[in-house]
Interface confidence: low
């Protein structure tokens, strides 16, 4: 599995997303758990209701909630107020018995308030030494709108002056194509963007 | 109790489109997934798809890909399948059938609907 | 697409036999599996879940076995009004043949 790159604000919520294949894991529960260290094993944060056909009914466990699409083969991690303790590595998990197979592994960035007005240097806390330079990114940016009917990511204003990235990303990233992920049901603070790699070819 | 009470027979003409509609009652709509079942006269059982009640999202049968359509009603608690451009072997019977959370498989079944195709 | 293969197609037992049937997956389907019974002109009614769970109201002559690739249905003491079709059902996947051809049991 390659690992796929979510980018949050502190403070705000982001939201993972986790694909399958909706009929190989017909009638399995799901989980998230963090990763203790490369080789450690991953641990358990939460998974979804007990009763599989409930799967879409959201679940918490502290800031973090779970639901899963069973139907549409899509598993949501939310993240509420993200914190630079929340960046590292997780898992979207399918259960079966006492197995678990990797939907897709998580790499969580946690990038600074952008009002903060910091220095680019500061934005990212990073999650892991590892580099992950084959990693397929999904920037999931949420921000509350700025007394706008849209949210502010839809502004106007140039994509680089308006995205906090961590350093070492270009502010458009060649290679990369830009596409805006509709989900206002979910994201009342504000939107998404995901930015998907055209050359990854990881399978789920 | 619970009940699936499904729409009554139809004949139809090759190329044509039929949907049949199955009311549930006794039970909480949305709290369960919807599946469509046929059988064709003295065959087998086929599972043709499944709806999820809340979002609407399906899977359907690789067979019926492109031609099946599962939808829903929440507010009067009824799943629809519409099955396009007909052919004579699609005559059949066609059950819904509810999945329940405990088992997975299906435990009730509507009381079947004749649909037959014929020039 | 997995293929669910139930053996005998068909067998003439008596009342009070024992009767046993099997369904074989082309592929592990772990315990995803459940039988029904259907009788002419009637809906399919479910018998056992999860390979070996008894539907409630199922009478206790039923019993399932199985897991992975191969499954049993038994019937202990068969009686008059178990005379039917029995097809298995597998659920761990959802491709377009997910039901065995089933089983038909006849009065010898």
């Known amino acids: 599995h390659n690992t796929t790159v979510f980018q949050g604000v502190a403070g705000q919520s982001l939201q993972v997303s986790c694909p399958y294949d909706s009929m190989k894991h017909w009638g399995r529960r799901k989980a998230w758990c963090r990763q203790l260290g490369e080789k450690g094993p991953c641990q358990r944060v939460v998974s979804t209701h007990n009763l599989w056909l409930l799967s879409f009914l959201r679940r918490w466990n502290g800031s973090t909630a779970i639901t899963d699409d069973t139907l549409g083969g899509t598993l949501t991690i939310t993240l509420r107020n993200l914190q630079p303790h929340d960046a590292g590595l997780y898992q979207c998990q399918s259960l079966h018995g006492s197995e678990a197979d990797t939907l897709r592994k998580v790499l969580v960035e946690v990038l600074a308030d952008p009002l903060d007005h910091r220095d680019a240097g500061d934005l990212w806390f990073p999650g892991e030494s590892e580099s992950f330079e084959d990693a397929h990114v999904e920037h999931s940016i949420s921000r509350p709108s700025q007394g706008s009917h849209l949210p502010s990511c839809l502004s106007k204003e140039p994509l680089g002056r308006r995205n906090p990235l961590p350093t070492h990303f270009h502010p458009s990233p060649p290679g990369l194509h830009l596409s805006h992920q509709d989900s206002s049901s979910q994201r009342p603070l504000g939107c998404s963007l995901a930015w998907t790699e055209a050359r990854d070819t990881s399978t789920q | 109790q619970v009940q699936l009470v499904q729409s009554g027979a139809e004949v139809k003409k090759p190329g044509a489109s039929v949907k049949v509609s199955c009311k549930a009652s006794g039970y909480t709509f949305t709290g369960y997934h919807m599946s469509w079942v046929r059988q064709a006269p003295g065959q087998g059982l086929e599972w043709m798809g499944v709806?999820?009640?809340?979002?609407?999202?399906?899977v359907y049968a690789q067979k019926f890909q492109g031609r099946v359509t599962m939808t829903r009603d929440t507010s009067i608690s009824t799943a629809y399948m519409e099955l396009s451009r007909l052919r004579s072997e699609d005559t059949a019977v066609y059950y819904c059938a509810r999945i329940p959370s405990y088992t997975y498989a299906f435990d009730y079944w509507g009381q079947g609907t004749l649909v037959t195709v014929s020039s | 697409d997995i293929q669910m293969t139930q053996s005998p197609s068909s067998l003439s037992a008596s009342v009070g036999d024992r009767v046993t049937i099997t369904c074989r997956a082309s592929?592990?389907?772990?315990?995803?599996l459940a039988w029904y019974q259907q009788k002419p002109g009637k809906a399919p009614k479910l018998l056992i879940y999860r390979a070996s769970s008894l539907q409630s109201g199922v009478p206790s002559r039923f019993s399932g076995s199985g897991s992975g690739t191969d499954f049993t249905l038994t019937i202990s003491s068969l009686q008059p009004e178990d005379f039917a079709t029995y097809y298995c059902f597998q659920y761990r996947h959802m491709p377009s043949q997910t039901f065995g051809q089933g089983t038909k049991v006849e009065i010898k």
């Open positions: 709806i999820n009640p809340v979002s609407g999202n399906t």
């Open positions: 592929q592990d389907i772990s315990n995803y």
